[in-house]
């Protein structure tokens, strides 16, 4: 069975949108008007993972690109990257752990926890135009809360 997916955009809790910054990086910044078309559209796939009553495992691919957000160790630190995959084999229901995020809904906001690195979250900085990264703290300066906007296929 094909994996169930939906197209969406994400904005952080300060309403910053996510856009491409070079071929393998995302950054967060405020967009308005026609500039909104720059924001990346994700294909969010519902995959196997350590699902709980509070957490739904998903993979976040870039729509119509063979790129997926993944979490790996770089210099001994959990790091968020965009990873290129073989489009013939992805998305799939049984994604490797580094591609899986636990989608957590709290008070109408979403968090995306790395399955590979528990308690590390997709994060943005307070500052404008900074890279999207994997952060190990919640409730501090960095932003870990997002809203999701559905995009029609």
């Amino acid at each position: 069975a094909p994996v169930r997916s939906l197209n969406c955009t994400l904005r952080d809790s300060q309403q910053k949108s996510l856009v491409m910054s070079g071929p393998y990086e995302l950054k967060a910044l405020h967009l308005q008007g026609q500039d909104m078309e720059q924001q990346v559209v994700f294909s969010m796939s519902f995959v196997q993972g350590e699902e709980s009553n509070d957490k739904i495992p998903v993979a976040l691919g870039l729509k119509e690109k063979n790129l997926y957000l993944s979490c790996v160790l770089k210099d001994d630190k959990p790091t968020l990257q965009l990873e290129s995959v073989d489009p013939k084999n992805y998305p799939k229901k049984k994604m490797e752990k580094r591609f899986v995020f636990n989608k957590i809904e709290i008070n109408n906001k979403l968090e995306f926890e790395s399955a590979q690195f528990p308690n590390w979250y997709i994060s943005t900085s307070q500052a404008e135009n900074m890279p999207v990264f994997l952060g190990g703290t919640k409730g501090g300066q960095d932003i870990t809360d997002f809203t999701m906007q559905f995009v029609s296929s």
Partner: antibody
Framework: EVQLQESGPGLVKPSETLSLTCTVS????????VSWIRQPPGKGLEWIGL???????YYNSPLKSRLTISKDNSKSQVSLKLSSVTAADTAVYYC????????????????WGQGTLVTVSS | DIQMTQSPSSLSASVGDRVTITCQAS??????LNWYQQKPGKAPKLLIS???TLRPGVPSRFSGSGSGTDFTFTISSLQPEDFATYYC?????????FGQGTKLEIK
């Protein structure tokens, strides 16, 4: 060798809380999920819920409001608590290990305990 | 939740017979289907995972096939120790769900 062993009172009164412990050996609870399954006398198997290596839980809907699964990794023990029991909760209760093979076979249960019969009666 | 429909519910057969049990899922589960054997007073034992993968130590007379919604479990030549109850389990998504079971009895 992987082993799981359920223990707890064999008799529980209606409206009370059923408490069971699953003690494991041969693997670490921080690396594997553990499920609970039950089987009423002469009937089929019903999956109750599980606790993952990281401690997150998934409870099956029919029992969700009455169920708590927790664990102590250092003691290699998983516990199940089911509140407000009735005669319908009389069953053999099993714990079982999740295969935990990411991107291959995450949700299967490969090793089971021998089970413990719990009777709900006054 | 995914419903698993297993048939037959009971089956009488003789030693040496070929026996087939089927399991049907209410939705496509790819190959995420397991078969368990349970003997009276014992815990279920995993025989086959991922539809057709024989677990280590399980005799080759047991086999599984199928994908999607329709699955088959076969014992090619029944042995006396095979008389037991067999269950299918879908491991595609939570909550995990079992078939109703098939009791295999001596004819």
């Amino acid at each position: 060798e992987v082993q799981l062993q359920e223990s707890g009172p064999g008799l529980v009164k209606p409206s009370e809380t059923l408490s069971l412990t699953c003690t494991v050996s041969g693997f670490s609870l921080s690396d594997y999920g553990v499920s609970w399954i039950r089987q009423p006398p002469g009937k089929g198997l019903e999956w109750i819920g599980l606790i993952w290596g990281g401690g997150d839980t998934y409870y099956n809907s029919p029992l969700k409001s009455r169920l708590t699964i927790s664990k102590d990794n250092s003691k290699s023990q998983v516990s199940l608590k089911l509140s407000s029991v009735t005669a319908a909760d009389t069953a053999v209760y099993y714990c079982a290990r999740q295969t935990n093979l990411w991107a291959y076979d995450l949700y299967s249960m490969d090793y089971w305990g021998q089970g413990t019969l719990v009777t709900v009666s006054s | 939740d995914i419903q698993m429909t297993q048939s037959p519910s009971s089956l009488s057969a003789s030693v040496g017979d070929r026996v087939t049990i089927t399991c049907q899922a209410s939705t496509d589960i790819d190959d995420d289907l397991n078969w368990y054997q349970q003997k009276p007073g014992k815990a279920p034992k995993l025989l086959i995972s991922l539809g057709s993968t024989l677990r280590p130590g399980v005799p080759s007379r047991f086999s599984g096939s199928g994908s999607g919604t329709d699955f088959t479990f076969t014992i090619s030549s029944l042995q006396p120790e095979d008389f037991a109850t067999y269950y299918c389990l879908q491991s595609d998504r939570l909550p995990l769900t079992f078939g109703q079971g098939t009791k295999l009895e001596i004819k």
